[in-house]
């Protein structure tokens, strides 16, 4: 019962349905399944297509632009597990631009072991709000399910029984909503007892054996699982592979001869990209890990004496690293036979990921090009790079090329890093935060000084937004009042004192001490700092009686922290060297003063002997408010109050009921409700900076994913038609 069919290699099925039949006997796809780019298919083409044997995909399932496909319920009725051993851009299930898909219909899908789900731009897709993904995968918060028909609330999702007024499907709570769970109008989502974890359960709720994953035909029996939580061996699910078996592809046990066959098949074939499998830590794996080399007699990985060389030959002589995924392909490489192009625009935990994957590279035979890598601040992730040979050069005879890297501030820490560039020149243009001094240091260390021609290192577009001053200015005097700060700093004179044009004092309010110089500056001239130009002081010939330059900052807010720094303004010299000085950013708080008046006082009497008084804090506290002073004075009673006969029948009880005044800390809600009362004629509030930033990040993230998808999916046709089992992307 367990995996009744064959184990098939990963498949990329595109253009038409002919290759889809290769799935016919597959129980497990060891790899990924991509079905994509079928523009001529119609719904009737899928009517009789079904692959009921398919139980598990070890990597990911990707569906992209398959026309005519309306549901997966008949195509993959028994798909139970997607393991996500290797992911597509962090996703194990990707449904993207499926123009006719009306429902997912994967009603037996019980577990996505690793990775999350991306379902995007499917304008007919419903039955998404009825799926409780938390029952299928752990990292629900990483799911990205947007721009589907489901978003527009146009879906009339009806679970089985609903039309007859019954609730046949389990209901679970998500975001506080109690919703029936189903995949289609005829298939409920199976929800097992929480005690079963991800093992699955029978129809009546008895847990499957703890070695099962997703489902089983009988409870409590490791031979009756539909899929295995750990490893599969001879019709049974096991926690670990016993000797003489080895763990293979994270899901099954294989014997030595199986691993050996894979090794020799690859060795004897001329095919690029196949793996000569080896044995390490009871696993049959594609290659020895870093620090190990293969013993050819028994395929075992043995520790290297000293560093292990691992030469990586790049197809077509070069490789572009544009994501963590592409960097992973070079994991463990120590020598790159070819050239590297780094073009990284964004990503998570980048420095650590790049170091983990590229940090062992010691030598590049060609050139290294860093191009439009907005996400990079430093190249120190190339921790061991010692040699760029320059055997092949970028056009113009460059072996190191850095162009348009908006945030690159440091190449390497040259006090700790040696780099030799055997042949070729350096090219540096449009690296606005990279100081020329850093580039000149590289010339010296790498042995390329004197090779560069005049325009190879742009004097005006490198470091032009950076703080490249050599000397540190120190503040010598700071005095504060509630609205002023008096500053003085140590005098600074360049070698030719006439070069000093003055000082620029930068300041801004800074509630937190996390400000950097370039905060709030952009390419369009925005600047969040207030800048004051200050003339240089009179120069005295006696160094001991030098005037300390300074400035009195006026009109400041009381009890407010300001970030302040000062830098010199010096003439630009053509000898590639700019003198200057700059202070660190300091934080100075103005003194407290009297607060403004408390706002919106309200007094209400709630009994014959009490008055409740409430107010909002002052708009300008101008300090830490420790207490309020409340003054009251008894007023003379109105004589009418005494003369009135309170037993007169015509008197009405006061109609106003006492309700406590609003809470002082919630002024925003108070203001909001005032607007809301105006019969719905209110404007939507302008978006906050953080909302705008979030939307920008979101749209950038979407673009990055689409770029990645297109790069992976659109591959040039190969002239030969042979596709091997391990070819990751047949065209």
């Amino acid at each position: 019962h367990l995996y009744p069919g064959e184990v098939c290699p990963g498949m990329d099925i595109r253009n038409n349905l002919t290759r889809l039949h290769e799935l016919e006997n597959c129980s497990v796809i060891e790899g990924h399944l991509q079905i994509l780019l079928m523009f001529k298919t119609r719904p009737e083409d899928f009517r009789d297509l079904s692959f009921p044997k398919l139980i598990m995909i070890t990597d990911y399932l990707l569906l992209f632009r398959v026309y005519g496909l309306e549901s997966l319920k008949d195509l993959f009725p028994n798909l139970t597990v997607i393991r996500g051993s290797r992911l597509f851009f962090n996703y194990a299930l990707v449904i993207f631009e499926m123009v006719h898909l009306k429902e997912l219909g994967l009603y037996n899908l019980m577990n996505i072991t690793r990775g999350s789900v991306r379902i995007e731009k499917n304008n007919e897709l419903c039955y998404l709000a009825t799926i409780d993904w938390s029952r299928i995968l752990d990292s629900v918060e990483d799911n990205y399910i947007v721009l589907n028909k489901d978003d527009n609330e146009e879906c009339g999702d009806i679970c089985p029984g609903t039309a007859k007024g019954k609730t046949n499907c389990p209901a679970t709570v998500i975001n506080g909503q109690f919703v029936e769970r189903c995949w289609t109008h005829s298939h409920c989502q199976k929800v097992c007892p929480t005690i079963c974890k991800s093992h699955g359960c029978t129809a009546e709720g008895l847990c499957c054996h703890s070695e099962c994953l997703g489902n089983c035909s009988q409870p409590d029996d490791p031979t009756k699982c539909v899929a295995c939580r750990n490893f599969y061996l001879d019709g049974r699910c096991v926690e670990t592979c016993p000797p003489p078996y080895y763990h293979f592809q994270d899901w099954r046990c294989v014997n030595f001869s199986f691993c050996q066959d894979l090794h020799h098949k690859c060795k004897n074939s001329r095919r690029q990209g196949c793996h000569q499998y080896v044995i390490h830590n009871n696993k049959c794996i594609p290659e020895c890990p870093s620090g190990y080399t293969m013993n050819s007699s028994n395929l075992l990985c043995t520790p290297c004496l000293g560093p292990c060389p691992k030469v990586c030959h790049l197809l077509e002589g070069e490789k572009t690293i544009d994501s963590v995924t592409s960097a992973q392909e070079l994991r463990g490489c120590t020598v790159i036979n070819g050239s590297l192009i780094i073009n990284i625009r964004g990503g998570n935990n980048l420095a650590a990921e790049l170091e983990a994957n590229l940090g062992l590279i010691e030598e590049i035979s060609g050139y290294l090009k860093i191009r439009r890598s907005y996400a990079l601040v430093s190249l120190s992730f190339f921790r061991k790079l010692r040699l760029i040979r320059g055997e092949t050069l970028e056009i113009g005879n460059y072996s190191f090329y850095a162009l348009d890297n908006q945030n690159l501030r440091q190449l390497w820490d040259w006090s700790k890093h040696n780099l030799t560039i055997t042949q070729g020149k350096l090219f540096f243009h449009y690296n606005p935060k990279l100081c020329l001094s850093e580039i000149h240091k590289m010339e010296e260390v790498s042995g390329t000084k004197g090779r560069q021609e005049r325009n190879d290192i742009a004097l005006k577009t490198n470091g032009d937004q950076a703080s490249c001053e050599n000397e540190l200015l120190k503040f010598s005097y700071i005095r504060t009042s509630f609205d002023k700060i008096l500053l003085r700093w140590e005098p600074y004179w360049p070698p030719d004192f006439r070069d000093l044009l003055g000082f620029m004092l930068f300041y801004k309010e800074a509630p937190y001490q996390n400000v950097t110089e370039f905060d709030g500056q952009d390419a369009c001239g925005s600047n969040s700092w207030t800048v004051v130009d200050i003339d240089p002081p009179l120069r005295s010939n006696d160094p001991k009686s030098q005037n300390h330059p300074g400035w009195l900052m006026r009109g400041l807010k009381p009890w407010t922290q300001y970030a302040i720094f000062v830098k010199t303004l010096v003439t630009f010299s053509d000898e590639r060297r700019t003198y200057g000085a700059k202070s660190d950013i300091i934080y100075v708080q103005t003194d407290a003063t009297n607060p403004s008046v408390p706002l919106d006082p309200i007094s209400v009497s709630n009994s014959s002997s009490q008055i409740i008084l409430k107010w909002k804090p002052p708009s300008d506290p101008n300090g830490n408010i420790t207490h309020y002073l409340v003054f009251w004075e008894r007023q003379a009673e109105d004589s009418e109050l005494f003369e009135l006969d309170y037993c007169l029948k015509g008197l009405k009880l006061p109609s106003r009921t006492w309700s406590p005044p609003f809470e002082s800390e919630d002024s925003q809600k108070h203001n909001q409700s005032e607007y809301e009362d105006s019969a719905g004629e209110c404007c939507s509030c302008p978006k906050t900076d953080s909302q705008i930033l979030k939307e920008l990040e979101e749209s950038s993230f979407r673009k990055t994913f689409e770029d990645y998808l297109h790069n992976v999916v659109f591959v040039p046709r190969k002239t030969s038609s042979g596709t091997g089992a391990e070819d990751p992307r047949p065209s």
């Epitope: 389990p170 709570v173 929800v191 007892p193 008895l206 847990c207 703890s210 409870p219 409590d220």
Partner: antibody
Framework: QVQLVESGGGLVQPGGSLRLSCAAS????????MSWVRQAPGKGLEWVSA????????YYADSVKGRFTISRDNSKNTLYLQMNSLRAEDTAVYYC??????????????WGQGTLVTVSS | AIQLTQSPSSLSASVGDRVTISCRAS??????LNWYQQKPGKAPNLLIY???SLQSGVPSRFSGSGSGTDFTLTIAGLQPEDFATYYC?????????FGGGTKLEIK
């Protein structure tokens, strides 16, 4: 047919200990999870503890965690409940019950006749 | 822990009556609920498992329904031997919990 017979109940002082046993017959004992459920005089049922068929997994109600220990001897077809630091509120009839399968699924069928534990000074 | 609230806590009925006992869970337990019958001085007996499946040997006048948080035990045509206390019990998550019981008495 399946039979479960509890023993070991009796009177014990607060802070004292007691060990209950449940002798099973009529089924393959090691293939089934077992549970203890108690019922205070005139009150409802309260699940106390469960153990898987192999004895590898144990589960407890919060009210007894750290004081009671469930165990089994599959060679003797016997289930045990070691009760320490007993309190007056532990006074109840203690039933042992067989589960439907080897994992503790919480299906109690059948039950033993019960044994009374009285905690009093 | 999941709380189960049974209602009513006691109920009087006559032979031949149709009675329903309700059990409400503090959170969704899908259909993972059992019903037991207990007669005085005796151990409980499993009547209904997984909300609606009849345990073998139990008369067909007993039936169970419901899912999510609301469940019902129905006895269609009470017999003299049905006067007892009835308990619901969830097996969705640890710790397993029982309802407070419903005592069914002869009117």
């Amino acid at each position: 047919q399946v039979q479960l017979v509890e023993s070991g109940g009796g009177l014990v002082q607060p802070g004292g200990s007691l060990r209950l046993s449940c002798a099973a017959s009529g089924f393959t004992f090691s293939s089934y999870a077992m549970s203890w459920v108690r019922q205070a005089p005139g009150k409802g049922l309260e699940w106390v503890s469960a153990i898987s068929g192999s004895g590898g997994s144990t589960y407890y109600a919060d009210s007894v965690k750290g004081r009671f220990t469930i165990s089994r001897d599959n060679s003797k077809n016997t289930l045990y409940l070691q009760m320490n630091s007993l309190r007056a509120e532990d006074t109840a009839v203690y039933y042992c019950a067989k589960d439907r399968v080897g994992a503790a699924n919480g299906w109690f069928d059948p039950w033993g006749q019960g044994t009374l534990v009285t905690v009093s000074s | 822990a999941i709380q189960l609230t049974q209602s009513p806590s006691s109920l009087s009925a006559s032979v031949g009556d149709r009675v329903t006992i309700s059990c409400r869970a503090s959170q969704s337990i899908t259909s993972y609920l059992n019903w037991y019958q207990q007669k005085p001085g005796k151990a409980p007996n499993l009547l209904i498992y997984a909300a609606s499946s009849l345990q073998s040997g139990v008369p067909s006048r007993f039936s169970g329904s419901g899912s999510g948080t609301d469940f019902t035990l129905t006895i269609a045509g009470l017999q003299p031997e049905d006067f007892a206390t009835y308990y619901c019990q969830q097996f969705d998550s640890y710790p397993f919990t029982f309802g407070g019981g419903t005592k069914l008495e002869i009117k």
